[in-house]
């Protein structure tokens, strides 16, 4: 004969555990039903009556099967530098992530607690390491033969165009200016539509990104905005 199915609440066999989606109530000494996600225990079980569950109140949630007396409060509304990637519902917490152009300077279990604007490399400096969701941009000075004339969190140093006749030599923050109307094209890797090297200056490639020395951010410790690195601007 098949074993009889026990209905909650029931006393478990000695040494056995309660079934899936049940919990052992110490007071009643019975296996009782858990509440489903989006609910909480309004009345705990007794020897003769099962758990009474109720829906989570506005702006609260439970994500798991549970027997908590109150649902958890959803996190605050997302700030202006964030976007809500998951709404607060009865079954899930709100998740805020940083909007484009920002990165997470202080994470939390899910989403971000504190967003900061991505560093912008000023003219003469290019992006050595792009920003990610959780790390800032790393800037580096443009190497000889390359330049960046923008204040940007995405632009790298680009090779100077190489002229038949140079009108104004390039520097770290400005491209070379040619007198010739049709400069030859550069063969520099990654450089699109750039002039051919004909001057005595050697051909330059894009600078190799260097490892960042930016500190890693612990999500346990609040951290103020870091001072801008050399070549960055904080606007």
């Amino acid at each position: 004969l098949p074993a009889q199915v026990a209905f909650t609440p029931y006393a478990p066999e000695p040494g056995s555990t309660c079934r899936l989606r049940e919990y052992y109530d110490q007071t009643a000494q019975m296996c009782c039903s858990k509440c489903s996600p989006g609910q909480h225990a309004k009345v705990f079980c007794t020897k003769t009556s099962d758990t009474v569950c109720d829906s989570c109140e506005d702006s609260t949630y439970t994500q798991l099967w549970n027997w908590v007396p109150e649902c958890l409060s959803c996190g605050s509304r997302c700030s202006s530098d964030q976007v809500e990637t998951q709404a607060c519902t009865r079954e899930q917490n709100r998740i805020c992530t940083c909007r484009p152009g920002w990165y997470c300077a202080l994470s939390k279990q899910e989403g971000c607690r504190l967003c900061a604007p991505l560093r912008k490399c000023r003219p003469g400096f290019g992006v050595a390491r792009p920003g990610t969701e959780t790390s800032d941009v790393v800037c580096k000075p443009c190497a000889p033969g390359t330049f960046s004339n923008t204040t940007s969190s995405t632009d790298i140093c680009r090779p100077h165009q190489i002229c038949n006749v140079v009108a104004i030599p390039g520097n770290a923050s400005m491209d070379a200016v040619c007198t010739s109307t049709s400069p030859t094209r550069s063969m520099a890797p990654g450089a699109v539509h750039l002039p051919q090297p004909v001057s005595t200056r050697s051909q330059h490639t894009q600078p190799t990104p260097e490892p960042s020395t930016a500190p890693s951010t612990s999500f346990l410790l609040p951290m103020g905005p870091s001072p801008p690195a050399e070549g960055s601007t904080g606007d």
């Epitope: 506005d58 509304r77 709404a87 607060c88 519902t89």
Partner: antibody, heavy 120, light 108 residues
Framework: QVQLVQSGSELKKPGASVKVSCKAS????????MHWVRQAPGQGLEWMGR????????KHDPKFQDKAVLSSDTSVSTAYLQISSLKAEDTAVYYC?????????????WGQGTLVTVSS | DIQMTQSPSSLSASVGDRVTITCTAS???????LHWYQQKPGKAPKLLIY???NLPSGVPSRFSGSGSGTDFTLTISSLQAEDAATYYC?????????FGQGTKVEIK
């Protein structure tokens, strides 16, 4: 755009009942609450109760528990407030207002109000 | 019930003045659950500040809110003629949810 449009003014005799409607448009009725707030002439705002249109669950200020019945019909995106056993002191403007789930009860859109006058 | 007491009940100020309205709760209210509404004569209330200090889009930045626990403040940094209205605080921390009695702001 989001709109809450309420039914027109009502003149009722004491002891009668009245049903005020609030038609919602421009948003999904899911994951919102519809609240009813009353304002007697020259007085402040008084929260009466709230309904979750998706489930029909209601919550009242105990003061209005036996006075006000909240209901909703999601097929026509309309919430209703029925007030029974009207007295002169129920003369007020009745507002519906919505609060999205997760916004901690902030009522971000309000109906234009329905004046209910109770007079013999 | 949580009682919400606003002060002053009414005030008269000149255009450009800084105006402060306080709201005191009879027991602690989580800052997420404290909101302010503005109501002009003959009109429905309008959400002015949500969760103590956040402005909905379209609300001028001269309005600000602060506070925690039982004491909350609404500030108008530079009063404008169109700010003549009654202002209500509202707690959604414990049911029944309650409003303050209102503060009427008039322009001198």
């Amino acid at each position: 755009q989001v709109q809450l449009v309420q039914s027109g003014s009502e003149l009722k005799k004491p002891g009668a009942s009245v049903k005020v409607s609030c038609k919602a448009s421009g948003f999904n009725n899911k994951d919102i609450y519809m609240h009813w707030v009353r304002q007697a002439p020259g007085q402040g705002l008084e929260w009466m109760g709230r309904i979750d249109p998706a489930t029909g669950n209601t919550k009242h200020d105990p003061k209005f528990q036996d006075k006000a019945v909240l209901s909703s019909d999601t097929s026509v995106s309309t919430a209703y407030l029925q007030i029974s056993s009207l007295k002169a002191e129920d003369t007020a403007v009745y507002y519906c207002a919505r609060s999205p789930y997760g916004d901690f009860g902030a009522m971000d859109y309000w109906g234009q109000g329905t004046l209910v006058t109770v007079s013999s | 019930d949580i009682q919400m007491t606003q002060s002053p009940s009414s005030l008269s100020a000149s255009v450009g003045d800084r105006v402060t309205i306080t709201c005191t709760a009879s027991s602690s209210v989580s800052s997420n659950y404290l909101h302010w509404y503005q109501q002009k004569p003959g009109k429905a209330p309008k959400l002015l500040i949500y969760s103590t200090s956040n402005l909905p889009s379209g609300v001028p930045s001269r309005f600000s809110g602060s506070g925690s626990g039982t004491d909350f403040t609404l500030t108008i940094s530079s009063l404008q003629a169109e700010d003549a209205a009654t202002y209500y605080c509202h707690q959604y921390h414990r049911s029944p949810w309650t409003f303050g009695q209102g503060t009427k702001v008039e322009i001198k």
